[in-house]
Amino acid sequence: SERCDDWGLDTMRQIQVFEDEPARIKCPLFEHFLKFNYSTAHSAGLTLIWYWTRQDRDLEEPINFRLPENRISKEKDVLWFRPTLLNDTGNYTCMLRNTTYCSKVAFPLEVVQKDSCFNSPMKLPVHKLYIEYGIQRITCPNVDGYFPSSVKPTITWYMGCYKIQNFNNVIPEGMNLSFLIALISNNGNYTCVVTYPENGRTFHLTRTLTVKVVGSPKNAVPPVIHSPNDHVVYEKEPGEELLIPCTVYFSFLMDSRNEVWWTIDGKKPDDITIDVTINESISHSRTEDETRTQILSIKKVTSEDLKRSYVCHARSAKGEVAKAAKVKQKVPAPRYTVELACGFGAT
């Protein structure tokens, strides 16, 4: 066959679907690879062809669209399973072509089993709620396009294994789940089960997401440098190791880049000829506030190094701060026989 622009296996879109549930999968060509949509392609006389490779096989085979009850079908640029089976797992390819043009992409589809408490190997999206922030909602994800707006599905919400009924601060409202005031105790996995009829059959869509309660923007502050501070003096003799920790607390801020860096005499440590190493560690609180520690280390400090300015800097979306470490050279203790004796008037 003639040359085809092959975008390869698009592992960035590892699609996971539950066994025995409907799944609608759009051909990724139009979403991520080509500059035109399906309608334009179709009206230009291009045809969309689907095929697949079963799990642990190398052989590409056509998809059987003649299964009972149209279990697998194609509609425009969407491949439909009504419902999926475990052995539908494999790599699926959509190819757009006519006599002069060809483009194709493959993507992995994994059909996943779940237990009665909705536990499964499915990768779960995380939804962050601000702690004690007033009413916040989560919405049952990825259910658009499964049924027409004229169909009114039933939606049941679960926290873990338990149906959400008469919960103190969590109220199901159809496709939405409202948290009246989010608390740490609301952390966990939430599942919506959407049930709808189609052609005399009943289908279920199961969607699970993880709720993580995080620090509220109402309580967010600029970075706080705990160390270095004015109470600690790093007093060293030449030849000793100088270790200065910079410990910074960052409030949780959605999509904020937290950064900590040292300057030595106003320069990036790499830019000056000192044998300096910097090691970083990061820890998080239950509400995802962050504490970063960068330890600046000079193995054998010189008297020149002890005169330098060591400043820790920190920045988040809330602001930038800096703090200098107090570094000084230790005054050697007097040698009794000479210095002290002279002090007593000995000659």
Partner: antibody, heavy 124, light 107 residues
């Protein structure tokens, strides 16, 4: 606002020394590098050296290393550049210029504020 | 020491023109490059630092690009006040070097 005010023009004999001052105001003097740059008549810019006032650390252009000394007086927020063994080719406008401390976001040490320049003429 | 080479050394252009000046470093300087404008009898003025960050108060017709060894200053539409000499400078490590300058003259 940030200001760098330099001392007045100087006329010097070959073999002598010159000391140019640069008084800083409108920012925290100790935490920014102070650079010295010169420009001979009709020529380009030439970096001479820099000092970090908080610690007194200084770096010099190899070309001037033996003849130039940069110092600061923290109490008056003033930087000084002394050039010794003057020759006629040292006739130039001498500028002081501030450069910021390194920032993770803004990168290195661009010269963001400049003095008005001091003309030093070396002539016998 | 890192050498900075600017081109062209001079160029003539008209008001409204798009102008490009290039600067090449003798070794990689990451994005540590600044551009300055100097008018006769005046101190240089910082236009761009860190290769593409516009300095405070500089009009948006000035832009910088590049990283590693090759850098460009572009003036999208020349204004009468833009006729001057332009210098690049690497601001990296413990020594700073300027390019030899590009004189931008009215055609």
């Amino acid at each position: 606002q940030v200001q760098l005010v330099q001392s007045g023009a100087e006329v010097k004999k070959p073999g002598s020394s010159v000391k140019v001052s640069c008084k800083a105001s409108g920012y925290i003097f100790l935490t920014y590098w102070m650079n010295w740059v010169r420009q001979a008549p009709g020529q380009g810019l030439e970096w001479m050296g820099q000092i970090f006032p908080a610690s007194g650390s200084a770096y010099y252009n190899e070309k001037f290393k033996d003849r130039v000394t940069i110092t600061v007086d923290k109490s008056t927020s003033t930087a000084y550049m002394e050039l010794s063994s003057l020759r006629s080719e040292d006739t130039a406008v001498y500028y002081c210029a501030r450069s910021g401390p390194y920032s993770y976001y803004a990168g290195g040490y661009a010269l963001d504020y400049w003095g008005q320049g001091t003309l030093v003429t070396v002539s016998s | 020491d890192i050498q900075m080479t600017q081109s062209p050394s001079s160029l003539s252009a008209s008001v409204g023109d798009r102008v490009t000046i290039t600067c090449r470093a003798s070794q990689s300087i990451s994005s540590y490059l600044a551009w300055y404008q100097q008018k006769p009898g005046k101190a240089p003025k910082l236009l761009i630092h860190y290769a593409k960050s516009l300095a405070e108060g500089v009009p948006s017709r000035f832009s910088g690009s590049g990283s590693g060894t090759d850098f460009t200053l572009t003036i999208s539409s020349l204004q009468p006040e833009d006729f001057a000499t332009y210098y690049c400078q690497h601001h990296y490590g413990t020594s700073l070097t300027f390019g030899q300058g590009t004189k931008l003259e009215i055609k």
